[in-house]
């Protein structure tokens, strides 16, 4: 139903990385505008992105209030220039999004190797603890703050002269690995949340190799 010159939104999709969360939908508007509402399962609807011609709405500020809650959004369609107009049932056309639980579903962003330091035959590799938009006591939390021990990192490391990737894992942001003396190694890390069933892994960090400026070598 609805007025003849509006169409309901469709393909409502959550796009979320490290809790930065945007709802996207179709179609590109022709003589119509959209308003988005979001709520938790038990909460009230809150309107966002009023009368927009965009086909996306940044809902980060709402979902970071409680990332473990499950959210539902809906997109209302209104005729352009006549937003009071409603459908035949007395209300504007709208479409519901899939449910979205940020803690379980946000994609893990690409991690970054902050540094590595070689001391003899040991190398300490440190992963940058990325800041998220989740706040507690007016402070932005890091990915580790939010996920705690649920978040692990997998380190891939290999001799520059070889192709086989050894692995190590940590539930902190640091690795301490054994290496062969006199060999140069390359490193890449991946964030993983093993308790998830989907979106378990991030993409790999950029590769960093010994002999580059990020690293430090100390002969003991």
């Amino acid at each position: 139903s609805g007025t003849t010159n509006t169409v309901a939104a469709y393909n409502l999709t959550w796009k979320s990385t490290n809790f930065k969360t945007i709802l996207e939908w179709e179609p590109k508007p022709v003589n119509q505008v959209y308003t988005v509402q979001i709520s938790t399962k038990s909460g009230d609807w809150k309107s966002k992105c009023f009368y927009t011609t965009d086909t996306e709405c940044d809902l980060t500020d709402e979902i970071v209030k409680d990332v473990k809650q499950t959210y539902l959004a809906r997109v209302f369609s209104y005729p352009a220039g006549n937003v009071e107009s409603t459908g035949s049932a007395g209300e504007p056309l709208y479409e519901n999004s899939p449910e979205f639980t940020p803690y379980l579903e946000t994609n893990l962003g690409q991690p970054t190797i902050q540094s590595f330091e070689q001391v003899g035959t040991k190398v300490n590799v440190t992963v940058e603890d990325e800041r998220t938009l989740v706040r507690r006591n007016n402070t932005f939390l890091s990915l580790r703050d939010v996920f705690g021990k649920d978040l692990i990192y997998t380190l891939y490391y290999w001799k520059s002269s070889s192709s086989g990737k050894k692995t190590a894992k940590t539930n902190t942001n640091e690795f301490l690995i054994d290496v062969d003396k006199g060999e140069n190694y390359c490193f890449s890390v991946q964030a993983v949340i093993p308790s998830r069933t989907v979106n378990r892994k991030s993409t790999d960090s950029p590769v960093e190799c010994m002999g580059q400026e990020k690293g430090e070598f100390r002969e003991i």
Partner: antibody
């Protein structure tokens, strides 16, 4: 339900090649890691190698390095073990197993195995 | 590579017996040790992970412990379905390695 099904085993002559498949269902392989483990008749378990299907990274046991190649086709949710220059000592039941990927749990689900016999 | 030395290689026991199998790592592996059960013609099944945690669905008569680089699998009261071969495995470093196996037979 998580399931791994190996196929492609059989009789092959020394020096020959064989490709084993490991078809996964109930999970997406790119979210996990896949290992191959073998067991010679009457012997223990020997790790062969792994792949991270998300990036193609692999590592192999010294005994198969340069002869075996692990690959994955994420669109088919299947991992493969390409075995070249086969030797009599490669005769074994080959298992694929899922690596849960945590600090604490590694190989949580295994396939039923497929027998490879290398003999003239 | 890390060696996992498992003992005994076989043992005979009766239903109701307490059975202990040990595995020694050649270097520190933290708690990254698993125990598997394998019956003839079947794939291994995970019993214990992280040295001492019981995997989902595994009977509570199975338990694991760690003392330094020594790891122990204990079956508190052997049942008929427990006659099988048991393997330890470390996954602390690449490559992961298995113990040689312990065959538990009926006395």
């Amino acid at each position: 339900e998580v399931q791994l099904v190996e196929s492609g085993g059989g009789l092959v002559q020394p020096g020959g090649s064989l490709r084993l498949s490991c078809a996964a269902s109930g999970f997406t392989i790119s979210d996990y890691w896949i290992h191959w483990v073998r067991q010679a008749p009457g012997k223990g378990l020997e790790w062969v190698g792994y792949i991270d299907p998300a990036n193609g990274y692999t590592y192999y046991a010294d005994s198969v390095k340069g002869r075996f190649t692990i690959s994955a086709d994420t669109s088919k949710n299947t991992a493969y073990l390409q075995m070249n220059s086969l030797r009599a000592e490669d005769t074994a039941v080959y298992y694929c197993a899922r690596d849960y990927g945590s600090l604490h749990v590694q190989l949580d689900y295994w396939g039923q195995g497929t027998l490879v016999t290398v003999s003239s | 590579d890390i060696q996992m030395t498992q003992s005994p290689s076989s043992l005979s026991a009766s239903v109701g017996d307490r059975v202990t199998i040990t595995c020694r790592a050649s270097q520190d592996v933290n708690t990254a040790v698993a125990w598997y059960q394998q019956k003839p013609g079947k794939a291994p099944k995970l019993l214990i992970y992280s040295a001492s945690f019981l995997y989902s669905g595994v009977p509570s008569r199975f338990s694991g412990s760690r003392s330094g680089t020594d790891f122990t699998l204990t079956i508190s009261s052997l049942q008929p379905e427990d006659f099988a071969t048991y393997y330890c495995q470390q996954h602390y470093t690449t490559p992961p390695t298995f113990g040689q196996g312990t065959k538990v037979e009926i006395k």
